[in-house]
């Protein structure tokens, strides 16, 4: 480590660790720069040589959160608890925990090689045709199509069952050894596994109570939205393949896990004459491309007061999938490079609808990072991580409401009326509440793995025991444990944790409420759109610009007025199709859930020789 | 804004027939379900039945066979027909919109 | 046919938290039951307050919830005010039709 890059001396009190914080935050900008510069490099160009690079990088990370972390220890271990200064607390508390930095050097360099070995093999896993040498399919974008707009069971199911084995069934060795590394890092921080740290930066002894409570509120709107959508599927698919009384075959649901299912919003939409809210093919016709759906999520922003994308960002970023056929990693991903000015996105973006509101998503991450880029590094987070998942979600449930899709332009006429808002609250459900049992589950199934109570003879049977549970649906082909089908979602291999977009899908409700009401809005709250409320601008700023230096309790409670996740607004923004769905349910003799749990399709006749291509 | 009002004939002899109306605003009767309620004197709620937003109807089947419900979607009215009235039929009936938009009710009194 | 219990009455005061519950003579009540809790007031006039289980209709205040405690449906009321003294209705679906309780007469000590 550079010696310039070492810690000093400073006084064992705490006017000491003010200096220490001071010296710790300009030496962890650089280090934090040439990681993420080297984490860029080899996500945008995945070579042996990146790789290579990119894990020498997080060595000198390693070093440098060791040597600055033993020293917290040293001189603040256990005084720092008692600091009068809140910020300084939250400082120390994050540079005294070592994470990977705890391993001997040989394993932090296996630690790197196996998160770098993971990344590699999700983002360049390919599924190619039976009996055709040549044709071969990335995940992005030519499986997502597939999944997308294919309505052939076989097709589904050969992209399905293709991606997750490439994906999944390599991963599973090293996943093991992720985890027994990992584990044993974070257990000299304290913690009793991987999953406990991670629970941890949401600050709460009751946070799985609290998250338990939350789903017990939404499960009723799912159960009724996953009725309603199976019913669908029957009446296009038939009795040989959709039970009514049974779970969902995964791979009819228009995306790869199911977790979201606006893309098949063709195939239930309630009321087919009205005007269509879907408006991709809308986009293609007015000739949007990438840079343009970045320009009008910008616009957005700035309407409200934010912060305008810098040219760093314009220059710097990867907003299409590369023609040159460099390997990259395409899922969309917003990166701070800690030195107050680089901010970039990568995103493989296609034109369509749902793009545009990930769009929207990721560029709610970077405008949080120019809000509180100015603080130490340590406080350079959102509030808690359903913070940071939540913002850009905010804006996207504005620029969704058809009556700004015809402010931008992609909806000829808005058409008021009851059909027309069921239409639109059905679309927005296929999104958000289809989403929420995946988000939950998907960290029940990995704090199991860390805690020892999934172990790897289980990692399959307990993800599909969660996803049958939870989601109410069925993998199309009989899996075993040779399957590791968690590897197939980008954010387990990826070592991404995944609660936070659970709580930020309930969490963007409470802040879309309150941000309505500021911008002076008293309709219903799904048709609010705080475009150009300066008022609502200000209130989110307030948010942003505090990062983590506030407990996220403190920071919800003076925007919303609570200081607690709360399922509430999320149910009054879907409650006409919350009333309609339950009508549709009750007329129709529908069963709610899957009493049938254990079903499982057949197999289409002649598969996979006679996929239709 | 959701409204509902019944309008019925107030008294009706025994043996004869009913017929109430409730007209709606501020939703479509092609969207939601409008169910009809009674409350006999001092007495709890009974559930009649429901016509759904596609047309469809179910019934309370103690009431079956006297009972029929219809509606107009574009005059937004939803039409309760009951026949054989006898004495216990008395009370207040009322439509409402899933259940949480009522009508104020009407009173119905089988006397001769 | 399926007989809705709930209890013929409760008494509470201000500020306190009350819950008033649903059984059904068939077993447990589920979401397939489509709990629903509606108030009529002294007035006779009949509001709904939770659609569904857990669903507050529009303008219902915060401190009413609806959820399923064990075997039953429950409508909690946090922070019991005067005004909620009334009377409380539940109503359970069964595959094709609807049955009220006989409903829960709420006395709020002002």
């Known amino acids: 480590l550079d010696p310039g890059l070492q810690p000093g001396n400073f006084s064992a009190d705490e006017a000491g660790a003010q200096l220490f914080a001071q010296s710790y935050n300009s030496s962890a900008e650089q280090v934090l720069f040439q990681s993420v510069a080297a984490s860029w490099a080899h996500d945008t160009n995945i070579t042996a040589e990146n790789a290579r690079r990119q894990e020498e990088a997080a060595l000198l990370s390693q070093e440098f959160a060791e040597a600055w972390g033993q020293k917290a220890k040293e001189l603040y271990e256990p005084i720092w608890q008692n600091f009068t200064d809140p910020q300084l607390r939250r400082i120390i508390g994050a540079v005294r925990t070592l994470g990977s930095a705890n391993l001997p050097l040989a394993k932090r360099q296996q630690y790197n090689a196996l998160l770098s070995n993971m990344s590699r093999i999700y983002s360049t896993a390919k599924v190619c045709l039976p009996n055709k040498t040549a044709t071969c399919w990335s995940l992005d974008p030519d499986l997502t199509n597939i999944l997308a707009s294919s309505r052939s069971y076989a097709m589904l199911l050969f992209a399905w069952e293709g991606w997750h084995n490439a994906a999944g069934i390599p991963l599973k060795p090293l996943y093991e050894d992720f985890t027994a590394l990992s584990n044993e890092a974070y257990k000299q921080d304290g913690f009793t596994d991987t999953g406990a740290y991670w629970r941890s930066w949401y600050n709460s002894p009751t946070f799985e109570d609290d998250l338990e409570h939350l789903y017990q509120q939404l499960e009723p709107l799912y159960l009724n939205l996953h009725a309603f959508v199976r019913r669908a599927l029957h009446r296009r698919y038939g009795d040989r393949y959709i039970n009514l009384r049974g779970p969902i075959p995964a791979h009819l649901l228009g995306d790869m896990w199911a977790q979201s299912w606006e893309n098949i919003y063709d195939m239930v939409v309630p009321f087919p004459d009205k005007p269509n809210l879907d408006v991709t093919s809308t986009m293609l016709q007015q000739g949007w491309n990438a840079t343009h759906m970045f320009r009008v999520a910008e616009e957005f922003f700035t309407s409200l007061e934010l912060s305008p994308m810098p040219p760093e960002f314009w220059e710097g970023s990867m907003l299409e999938k590369p023609a040159d056929g460099r390997e990259v990693v395409c899922h969309a991903s917003a990166w701070d490079f800690y030195n107050r000015k680089d901010f970039r996105i990568k995103q493989c973006t296609r034109v369509t609808m749902d793009q545009l509101s990930t769009v929207h998503h990721e560029m709610g991450h970077i405008q949080y990072y120019l809000q509180y880029k100015d603080l130490p590094v340590s406080l350079r987070r959102g509030a808690n991580p359903g913070f940071h998942e939540a913002i850009g979600d905010v804006l996207a449930l504005s620029v969704s409401t058809p009556e700004h899709l015809h402010k931008i332009g992609l909806l000829d006429r808005v058409t008021n009326d009851t059909e027309s808002d069921i239409n639109y609250l059905l679309k927005m459900a296929l999104e958000k509440i289809a989403f929420l049992p995946f988000g939950y589950l998907v960290d029940q199934w990995r704090w199991g793995v860390f805690s020892g109570r999934t172990p790897p003879s289980r990692y399959n049977f307990d993800w599909w025991y969660l996803r049958t549970k939870y989601q109410g649906i069925c993998p199309p082909v009989t899996r075993n444990e040779t399957h590791f089908d968690a590897g197939a979602k980008f954010h387990v291999p990826n070592v991404t944790p995944y609660i936070r977009y659970f709580v930020s899908f309930v969490l963007q409700f409470q802040f879309h409420e309150a941000l309505c009401k500021e911008a002076g809005y008293e309709g219903p709250l799904h048709q609010c759109d705080i475009y150009r409320s300066t008022k609502a601008g200000a209130k989110l700023r307030k948010v942003l610009q505090a990062g983590s230096s506030r407990p996220w309790q403190e920071v919800l409670k003076d925007m919303v007025g609570l200081d607690a996740l709360d399922a509430q607004p999320l149910l009054k923004y879907f409650q006409p199709v919350t009333q309609w769905l339950q009508e549709q349910n009750q007329q129709n003799g529908e069963v709610l859930g899957w009493p049938e749990y254990q079903w499982h399709p057949p197999l289409p006749d002649n598969y996979p020789e006679g996929i239709d291509l | 804004q959701v409204q509902l009002k019944e309008s019925g004939p107030g008294l009706v002899a025994p043996s004869q027939s009913l017929s109430i109306t409730c007209t709606v605003s501020g939703f479509s009767l092609t969207t939601y379900g409008v169910h009809w309620v009674r409350q006999p004197p001092g007495k709890g709620l009974e559930w009649l039945g429901v016509i759904w937003g596609g047309g469809n109807t179910n019934y309370n089947s103690a009431l079956m066979s006297r009972l029929n419900i219809t509606k107009d979607n574009s005059k937004r009215q939803v039409f309760l027909k009951m026949n054989s009235l006898q004495a216990d039929d008395t009370g207040m009936y009322y439509c409402?919109?899933?259940?949480?938009?009522w009508g104020q009710g009407t009173t119905l009194t089988v006397s001769s | 046919q399926a007989v809705v219990t709930q209890e013929s009455a409760l008494t509470t005061s201000p500020g306190e938290t009350v819950t008033l519950t649903c059984r059904s003579s068939?077993?447990?009540?589920?979401?397939?039951?489509?709990a629903n809790w509606v108030q009529e007031n002294p007035d006779h006039l009949f509001t709904g307050l939770i659609d569904g289980t857990n669903t507050r209709s529009p303008g219902v205040p915060a401190r009413f919830s609806g959820s399923l405690i064990g075997d039953k449906a429950a409508l909690t009321i946090t922070g019991a005010q005067t005004e909620d003294e009334a009377i409380y209705f539940c109503a359970l679906w069964y595959s094709n039709h609807w049955v009220f309780g006989g409903g829960t007469k709420l006395t709020v000590l002002g």
């Open positions: 068939t077993g447990a009540v589920t979401t397939n039951n489509y």
């Open positions: 409402a919109r899933g259940w949480d938009s």
